[in-house]
């Protein structure tokens, strides 16, 4: 921001009324009036160019310093070209000297040169040559000097003429202030510019109404330079929740809008499924039946729990069931849907039911499922199972009601045994199998059926209560098809896969475990 100038002395604006002191009295400097642009203008002028040894002084009135530390002196003046006088005026000069003196009181007409300190020699950039003078073209020069730090109550300026033809049209003395400033929602007070060029006065700012320093942020500060300019802004203020920045102020959010945190962002319109907010709202309440999860941003619409999974099927495969379902028709407005599968088993004879989570196995953990299918295995034969698939989202925990669909399935067969070849020889095959432990109590015997590959007319059957059997009297180097099936009180269980096992050839050495 531009510096503010506080004027202490303005000769041009005073209309010749200041009555400055001239020394020696009645010689040298003289107050004159002229006409420029049809307006009267006053000037202090001297033009003793034909006589040598000029020492003419013009002293201002005493100027009260006030709060100024460094003053700026702006001079507007004209100097005639020494060559514009007949014979060149050998003693003529084209410069004058600027002085100042500090004092705590006004000395009146008591003028003492020795009290004055020279500021500078003032030289014109442009001199008024004969043709300019004749044509009334005033070649106005502007020079500025500064003095500081000042410490006394007031000061004088003085102008020493040493034989020039000069007119002072304007003498303006001022000091600079950094003006009151609103920046980054912080108010900085009007501050007097310091006196030393390298130094910058640090000024603390105050947040405007309804603005605060953001958490972890720096307090607003600016630096007031010597020239009255604000520099190096540090920190900032931001509008508090419920308020937004409008130009240099924080304005309450309009009804139907909200802002939930200290930030630079504007107020946002209340999202879907919220009630109309009042002025200055920090949030928008959800409509009845709609909710906001703790982690949901305030800008997100309010949502509700999903409806039940749309379509659920349970396909039995022996002692396994594959559950498949489709997503809910109403997601509740959310994308974080997960599914939970629970299992209940009932004994047909007694009608007694109970949870079966501990006795079954799921293809993946049954809670927090994101996919829409799961396989349940280790089911007991001749048991009724009911599976419940519940759809949940981020706000389901905020209501007591649940959204689920159920499917029931009856398991009539044991799971097919898993068969392994334990060993073989030229005339025998040793076979073992296994079924899930929960089903083993239901098995009465295991039936092993085998036949030569390619012979569809005859087969052999062996029954056993154990989990292995050795099939002997077999032909060497021959492939046999082997299947194992559990027998229960209610009938046959599911048969295993048909396995192909081959006996060893006569050249083979002894039995070989596989």
């Amino acid at each position: 921001a531009q510096g503010k100038e506080v004027v202490l002395l303005d000769f041009a604006a005073a209309g010749g009324e200041l009555g400055w002191l001239t020394h020696p009295y009645g010689k040298g400097w003289d107050l004159m009036q002229n006409i420029m642009n049809d307006m009267p203008i006053y000037m202090y002028s001297v033009c003793n160019v034909m006589s040598g040894d000029q020492d003419n002084w013009l002293r201002t009135n005493w100027v009260y310093r006030g709060e100024a530390e460094r003053i700026f002196i702006e001079l507007k003046f004209t100097v005639r070209d020494c060559n514009s006088f007949p014979g060149g005026a050998s003693s003529c000069k084209e410069t004058f000297n600027l002085y100042y003196a500090e004092s705590d009181l006004d000395y009146g007409t008591n003028f003492q040169k020795r009290l004055f300190t020279k500021i500078d020699t003032i030289a014109p950039d442009e001199i008024t040559v004969s043709s300019d003078f004749e044509a009334r073209h005033v070649k106005l020069n502007v020079e500025e000097r500064s003095v500081g730090p000042l410490t006394r109550k007031g000061f004088y300026l003085a102008f020493q003429d040493i034989g020039a033809c000069v007119a002072l049209l304007s003498v303006r003395v001022y000091y600079k202030k950094c003006p009151e400033l609103l920046q980054s929602l912080a108010r900085f007070p009007e501050t007097i510019a310091g006196s030393d060029a390298p130094s910058l006065a640090t000024v603390a700012g105050t947040c405007v109404d309804h603005a605060v320093v953001p958490p972890g942020g720096e307090e607003p500060r600016m630096h007031c330079a010597v020239d009255g300019e604000w520099l190096v802004p540090i920190g900032q203020c931001l509008c508090q929740a419920g308020y937004e920045k409008v130009e240099d102020a924080c304005q309450a959010c309009s009804p139907g809008f909200f802002k939930f945190e200290v930030s630079e962002s504007p107020c946002l319109e209340c999202p879907e499924h919220t009630l109309p907010s009042p002025e200055g709202a920090t949030s928008c309440e959800c409509e009845e039946g709609f909710f906001r999860a703790p982690q949901d941003p305030m800008s997100m619409p309010c949502t509700r729990p999903p409806s039940a999974p749309h379509y659920l099927t349970a396909v039995g495969m022996g002692a396994k069931v594959e559950l498949r379902w489709t997503p809910p028709q109403d997601s509740g407005g959310r994308e974080d849907i997960v599914y939970s599968v629970t299992c209940e088993q009932c004994w047909p004879e007694s009608g007694e039911c109970g949870p079966c989570e501990s006795s079954v196995r799921y293809s993946e953990p049954p809670h927090g499922l994101t996919r829409t299918s799961v396989t349940v295995s280790d089911l007991e034969p001749h048991m009724n199972y009911t599976f419940t698939v519940e759809a949940r989202n981020g706000v389901s925990g905020l209501v007591t009601s649940r959204s689920f669909r159920t499917a029931s399935v009856s398991i009539n067969q044991t799971e097919p045994p898993k068969v392994r070849l334990e060993g073989r020889s030229t005339t025998s095959l040793s076979v073992s199998w296994s079924i899930p432990p929960p089903q083993q109590s239901r098995v009465w015997k295991y039936e092993v059926t085998y036949r030569k590959k390619g012979d569809s007319n005859s087969y052999n059957v062996r029954r056993t209560e154990g989990f292995s059997v050795t099939l002997d009297d077999l032909a060497p180097d021959t492939t046999y098809l082997v299947q194992v099936q559990a027998l229960t009180q209610e009938g046959q269980g599911a048969g295993s896969k048909v396995h192909e096992f081959q006996t060893l050839s006569p050249e083979g050495s002894g039995s070989l475990a596989v």
């Epitope: 003289d30 004159m32 009036q33 002229n34 006409i35 009267p40 000037m43 002028s45 001297v46 033009c47 003793n48 160019v49 034909m50 004209t78 100097v79 005639r80 514009s84 006088f85 007949p86 008024t128 004969s130 043709s131 003078f133 004749e134 044509a135 009334r136 005033v138 033809c165 000069v166 007119a167």
Partner: antibody, heavy 128, light 107 residues
Framework: EVQLLESGGGLVQPGGSLRLSCAAS????????MAWVRQAPGKGLEWVSR????????HYADSVKGRFTISRDNSKNTLYLQMNSLRAEDTAVYYC?????????????????????WGQGTLVTVSS | DIQMTQSPSSLSASVGDRVTITCRAS??????LAWYQQKPGKAPKLLIY???NLHTGVPSRFSGSGSGTEFSLTISGLQPDDFATYYC?????????FGQGTKVEIK
């Protein structure tokens, strides 16, 4: 020595025209502002017109504006006053006058000039 | 236009007298004032410019003073050659105006 010599005056009828000349010598004519000043018989002095050192600007008294024209020829060191539509009240001795700002020991010139050097004058009589 | 009024319009004085002629401007003219001397049948001669500055070759018995609207020409010790008509002229405005003149006669 500075010398200004006017000529061209005489008797002229109202509405008539006359051209006055002023021959300058003894100074650098092209440095001087030149003017015409008149004096009616038994009356005081009245400024008529002025011209700058190089031919401009020119100024006129309200009483002659639009009728009189001032001009100069620096190569001939001569000043002129062309007078048209002459009236009885234009009857006067017409003086040629000059001003050299170099002799004016002042930092800023006044808006107008005073007259350092004068000719002896030429009489213009407007009568029927 | 700025009007210039001289007083008196005529005066009688003896050789050696101190004579003062005044000139009043209708508005402030600072020190932009000149004084001329004119003898019958002759051209005017410049005496004083810028209210108080003596023109080259003018005797020092002539002096001028004043500023603003009130000005005076003083002849300290009137000489026989000084009996003439004296005119003031303002050059603060482009219409350079003269006073009506003051005639100094022998008593």
């Amino acid at each position: 020595e500075v010398q200004l010599l006017e000529s061209g005056g005489g008797l002229v009828q109202p509405g008539g025209s006359l051209r006055l000349s002023c021959a300058a010598s003894g100074f650098t004519f092209s440095h001087y502002m030149m003017a015409w000043v008149r004096q009616a018989p038994g009356k005081g002095l009245e400024w008529v017109s002025r011209i700058g050192p190089s031919g401009g600007p020119t100024h006129y008294a309200d009483s002659v504006k639009g009728r009189f024209t001032i001009s100069r020829d620096n190569s001939k060191n001569t000043l002129y006053l062309q007078m048209n539509s002459l009236r009885a009240e234009d009857t006067a001795v017409y003086y040629c006058a000059g001003y050299d700002s170099g002799y004016d020991y002042v930092a800023v010139a006044g808006p107008a000039e005073y007259f350092q050097h004068w000719g002896q004058g030429t009489l213009v009589t407007v009568s029927s | 236009d700025i009007q210039m009024t001289q007083s008196p319009s005529s005066l009688s004085a003896s050789v050696g007298d101190r004579v003062t002629i005044t000139c009043r401007a209708s508005q402030s003219i600072s020190t932009w004032l000149a004084w001329y001397q004119q003898k019958p049948g002759k051209a005017p001669k410049l005496l004083i410019y810028k209210a108080s500055n003596l023109h080259t070759g003018v005797p020092s018995r002539f002096s001028g003073s004043g500023s603003g609207t009130e000005f005076s020409l003083t002849i300290s010790g009137l000489q026989p050659d000084d009996f003439a008509t004296y005119y003031c002229q303002q050059y603060n405005a482009y219409s350079r105006t003269f006073g009506q003149g003051t005639k100094v006669e022998i008593k």
